[in-house]
């Protein structure tokens, strides 16, 4: 058992150009607080995955009001450490997420509003009992400076808090085979009561006769290193030579209960009995109560009057997550018209419109023809945000400035010959065809298929297409 401790030294603008605007203003004073989430191992898990090693919220910092015209300074911080107790062995490798939250203290309806200012994450190796480790992390234009350490709670000692110490029975020395407990020289290492043969480096016990493995080790005596690469068959037998970790048949194999919870099999699954201060299906939730204000964005906290009972956040419309920290994706309803890009800014939806469109939802088609002229009698047509000219006969191009060759598209059917004419084109039809485009066959008896030839025109005469 032990405690992970986090000390925030400063939160403010990072070095370099583009200093962030102060998160608080005279109109909207605010204060900061922090949340830390710890997970065992060097896992690259999503921010939303459970904080299996535990989580903690800081107190609220002092109220801060920006001085007009002044650059954003380092912001005033909450007092004290963030402490995450762990009841189990300290894993040695861990992942962390540290979030900086802003509590706005303006005249919001329904109390203060919370918003996430910055989130930093990392993966570290850390031995329990060592000195404070210093770190600097950047999130956008913000910089967070902090220190952290893991320390064991007596009677536990060691880099994993797995060795136990007891007060000396004799004033001068420890019993046979037992060493003094550094740095507590007046105490002695307690006799190990683990299962016989349990690895002293990679195993530990909290009950007589048991042997529980540190992360990375497996086997009944914790002597087999876990390998993810050398297993030939994913469900083959476990062997001390390959060091393959094979899922056991029981639901409690590998103990799914975090934070020192004990697992018991049920007819259909498993059940975790959690230590004080933890709850959840796998004891993954640390003892935050409603008094800690865990619900963000105006969420209503229910239950959780003491650390042994779980709280539930009832989120206001538009927010979700166990702490109402996530916004629902409102852009999935595609409110922007005419191909506009939707941006959810939190307080409002914004649409970034394509060229030729404007308005809050890109609903206005801009008049592309304004100030544009189409030459040679052409008329301007709007559509799709693009300017287009409908050209008079004989002209083409974007602005109708080019003379068009009306015969270029070979408009005369059935081998008819095309002649350009000042008013358009004329088709000279091959024998047996007639019509403006030579599209109608002439029947052998002289009658045409459709329509009848106008009086005075014989089949085969050139026909002007007007």
């Amino acid at each position: 058992a032990g405690v992970f401790e986090l000390q925030i030294h400063s939160f403010g603008p990072g070095p370099g150009p583009g200093a962030p605007r102060s998160p608080c203003s005279a109109r909207l004073p605010c204060r900061l607080f922090f949340r830390v989430c710890l997970k065992p191992g060097l896992s690259e898990e999503a921010a939303e995955s459970p904080c299996a090693l535990g989580a903690a919220l800081s107190a609220r910092g002092p109220v801060y009001t920006e001085q007009p015209g002044a650059p954003a300074p380092d912001l005033p911080l909450p007092d004290g450490l963030l402490q995450v107790p762990f009841r189990d062995a300290w894993p040695g490798t861990f992942s962390f997420i540290i979030e900086t939250w802003r509590e706005e203290l303006g005249d919001q309806i329904g109390g203060p509003a919370w918003s996430l200012l910055a989130r930093v994450a990392g993966r570290r190796r850390l031995a329990a009992g060592g000195p404070w480790a210093r770190d600097i992390q950047r999130a956008g234009a913000w910089e967070l400076r902090f220190s952290y350490r893991a320390r064991c709670e007596p009677p536990a000692v060691g880099t994993a808090c797995t060795r136990l110490c007891r007060p000396r029975s004799a004033p001068s020395r420890c019993g046979p085979g037992l060493r003094p407990c550094a740095p507590l020289e007046d105490e002695c290492e307690a006799p190990l009561v683990c299962r016989a043969g349990c690895s002293p480096e990679h195993g530990f016990c909290e009950q007589p006769g048991e042997c529980r493995c540190l992360e990375g080790w497996t086997g009944p005596l914790c002597t087999v290193p876990v390998s993810t690469s050398s297993c030939l068959s994913p469900r083959g037998p476990s062997s001390a030579t390959t060091g393959c970790l094979v899922p056991g048949p029981g639901p409690c194999d590998g103990n799914p209960c975090a934070n020192g919870g004990s697992c018991s099999e049920t007819p259909r699954s498993f059940e975790c009995t959690c230590p004080r201060g933890f709850y959840g299906l796998r004891c993954e939730v640390s003892g935050v109560t409603c008094a800690d204000g865990p619900c963000f964005n105006g969420g209503l906290c229910v239950g959780g009057a003491d650390p042994d009972s779980a709280y539930i956040c009832h989120c206001p419309p538009g927010f979700q997550g166990s702490n109402c920290e996530k916004r629902v994706d409102r852009c999935s309803l595609q409110p922007c018209r005419n191909g506009g890009l939707c941006l959810d800014l939190g307080h409002a939806l914004r649409c970034r419109c394509r060229a030729g469109f404007a308005g809050p939802r890109c609903e206005h088609d801009l008049d592309d023809c304004a100030g544009r002229a189409c030459a040679n009698g052409g008329t301007c047509v709007e559509g799709g945000g693009a300017h287009r000219c409908s050209c008079a006969l004989g002209f083409g191009g974007r602005d109708c400035r080019e003379r068009a060759d009306p015969c270029a598209a070979r408009p005369c059917a059935h081998g008819g010959r095309c002649y350009a004419h000042f008013s358009g084109l004329v088709c000279a039809c091959a024998p047996g065809y007639m019509g403006a485009r030579c599209e109608f066959p002439v029947h052998p008896d002289g009658a045409s298929a459709l329509p009848a030839a106008p009086p005075g025109l014989r089949p085969g005469d050139p026909q002007r297409y007007l």
């Epitope: 419309p317 538009g318 409102r330 309803l333 595609q334 409110p335 922007c336 018209r337 005419n338 506009g340 939806l349 809050p360 939802r361 890109c362 609903e363």
Partner: nanobody, 120 residues
């Protein structure tokens, strides 16, 4: 102020059908986009079906061919006909609307939700 009032939720057996309704009322000049989201326990809220700002109809992949969205513009109401319901459709169904108000501003509104439970 704008209100979205959902109705039609309830308990149904797998393979059964339900029809949800959502009526919008208040200082509405026009409805730009309107549809249905759902949120199952412990899951993210997700879009089920909707009418976009361009009046296109969109559906989540998991409900295509089973759910149909329709609307009555005169009543500012949208409907979700749910057929061949499965256990995984169990969720709270929320109506959502992007509305242009009399002030010409646009605002996004949510209903309070209606519970749909699919169990044998």
């Amino acid at each position: 102020e704008v209100q979205l009032v959902e109705s039609g939720g309830g308990e149904v057996q797998p393979g059964g059908s339900l029809r949800l309704s959502c009526a919008a009322s208040g200082s509405i000049l026009s409805i730009n986009a309107m549809g249905w989201y759902r949120q199952a326990p412990g899951k993210q809220r997700e879009l089920v079906a909707g009418f976009t700002g361009d009046t296109n109809t969109i559906y989540a992949e998991s409900v295509k061919g089973r759910f149909t969205i329709s609307r009555d513009n005169a009543k500012n109401t949208v409907y979700l006909q749910m057929s061949s319901l499965r256990a995984e459709d169990t969720a709270v169904y929320y109506c959502a609307a992007d509305v242009q108000l009399f002030s010409r501003d646009y605002e996004f509104y949510w209903g309070q939700g209606t519970l749909v439970t699919v169990k044998p």
